[in-house]
């Protein structure tokens, strides 16, 4: 359960991959598309509003036997739109929604080496936002692999 309905803190940051490709958002046909691309030097990076929430997480709900206080995050690149996990399609999508946000909009934040982060689906433990074919996708990670796969590592730059 998420402790309280308001975030403990928020920050604006640009999101890039471990290999320094930018995550960008474009309005197309009244819906937003998410791209992973090399940005031209003079192009401004898109910013995302990260809202951080605390969550008590019993071990029975998680794929890795972890229990305790976790940090959850929602990601909003533009007003009223949030990144959401579509577990059926293994995709990451931008949806317009009102608060309270659905569980699909919450991701467990993992700090990683080299000051990278990973985003694990609240609704599907062991599944992370990752990069596949220049798009964001949901990627199942085997915990025995130490979660070191570069395709689920992201950098936050304020």
């Amino acid at each position: 359960s998420i402790t309280g309905i308001s975030p403990i803190t928020e920050s604006l940051a640009s999101l890039s991959t471990y290999n320094d490709q930018s995550i960008t958002f474009a309005l197309e046909d009244e819906s937003y598309e998410i791209y992973v691309e090399d940005l031209k030097k003079d192009k401004k990076k898109d910013k995302v509003l990260l809202s951080y929430y605390e969550s008590q997480h019993p071990s029975s709900e998680s794929g890795d036997g972890v229990d305790g206080k976790m940090l959850m995050v929602t990601l909003s690149p533009t007003k009223d739109f949030w990144l959401q996990a579509n577990n059926k399609e293994h995709s990451v999508e931008l949806h317009k929604c009102e608060k309270p946000l659905p569980d699909q909009a919450f991701f467990v934040l993992h700090n990683r080496s080299f000051n990278c982060v990973s985003f694990e689906c609240k609704t599907d433990p062991g599944v992370f936002i990752g990069v596949k074919d220049n798009h964001l996708a949901l990627i199942k990670v085997d915990y025995s692999e130490n979660l070191g796969s570069e395709n689920i590592l992201f950098k936050l730059s304020e």
Epitope: S59, V66, K69, L71, N111, N115
Partner: antibody, heavy 122, light 107 residues
Framework: QVQLVQSGAEVKKPGASVKVSCKAS????????ISWVRQAPGQGLEWMGW????????HYVQKFQGRVSMTTDTSTSTAYMELRSLRSDDTAVYYC???????????????WGQGTLVTVSS | DIQMTQSPSSVSASVGDRVTITCRAS??????LAWYQQKPGKAPQLLIY???SLQSGVPSRFSGSGSGSDFTLTISSLQPEDFATYYC?????????FGGGTKVEIK
């Protein structure tokens, strides 16, 4: 309740090694990362590095790289910090501290061991 | 590395006083800043995390604010048990770094 209990004080000669233990109780040990922080007499706090109790991943501050090893034994819920090639300026109280979030270091340290005084003297 | 500079390094105050300690970062970051209290011969104790969130069990006279590169710890009405040394710590990125400490002494 959560407790981190550290091993007792040590006196070592320059060039020797010391291994400090930190036994955790009152929570699921492999859910939280452990950091090691030291404090020289009359000085401030200095972070040495971190280890994930979940998978053993670690990160050491550059100045300690090559001299420090942080390990965990999940069967006994114990974290260890070994410092080698001791010098007189390693004389300090060494603390283990639990990160307050299971998967993140953003929240600081919510529980600390009582500290272990390591004296390096010839 | 992010350097944390605390000021003042010491402050003399009386019971009931309002005390403010500041912490400045060498580069801006979000709100991942913690404050600790340490008494002689004891381990530090977490007071504030995420710049302004009060740790469970900590009295409400302690409060934190700030973001970017300037952060503040305020004790609204100093109590006898509050005479101690206070440290800030950035938890934003490795290496994690502490401020030099502020000693709050009895006037």
């Amino acid at each position: 309740q959560v407790q981190l209990v550290q091993s007792g004080a040590e006196v070592k000669k320059p060039g020797a090694s010391v291994k400090v233990s930190c036994k955790a109780s009152g929570y699921t040990f492999n859910s939280y990362g452990i950091s090691w922080v030291r404090q020289a007499p009359g000085q401030g706090l200095e972070w040495m590095g971190w280890i994930s109790s979940h998978n053993g991943n670690s990160h050491y501050v550059q100045k300690f790289q090559g001299r420090v090893s942080m390990t965990t034994d999940t069967s006994t819920s114990t974290a260890y910090m070994e410092l080698r090639s001791l010098r007189s300026d390693d004389t300090a109280v060494y603390y283990c501290a639990r990160h307050s979030y299971t998967t993140s270091w953003y929240g600081g340290f919510d529980y600390w061991g009582q500290g272990t005084l390591v004296t390096v003297s010839s | 590395d992010i350097q944390m500079t605390q000021s003042p390094s010491s402050v003399s105050a009386s019971v009931g006083d309002r005390v403010t300690i500041t912490c400045r970062a060498s580069q801006g970051f979000s709100s991942w800043l913690a404050w600790y209290q340490q008494k002689p011969g004891k381990a530090p104790q977490l007071l504030i995390y995420a710049a302004s969130s009060l740790q469970s069990g900590v009295p409400s006279r302690f409060s934190g604010s700030g973001s970017g590169s300037d952060f503040t710890l305020t004790i609204s009405s100093l109590q006898p048990e509050d005479f101690a040394t206070y440290y800030c710590q950035q938890a934003n990125s490795f290496p994690l770094t502490f401020g030099g400490g502020t000693k709050v002494e009895i006037k």
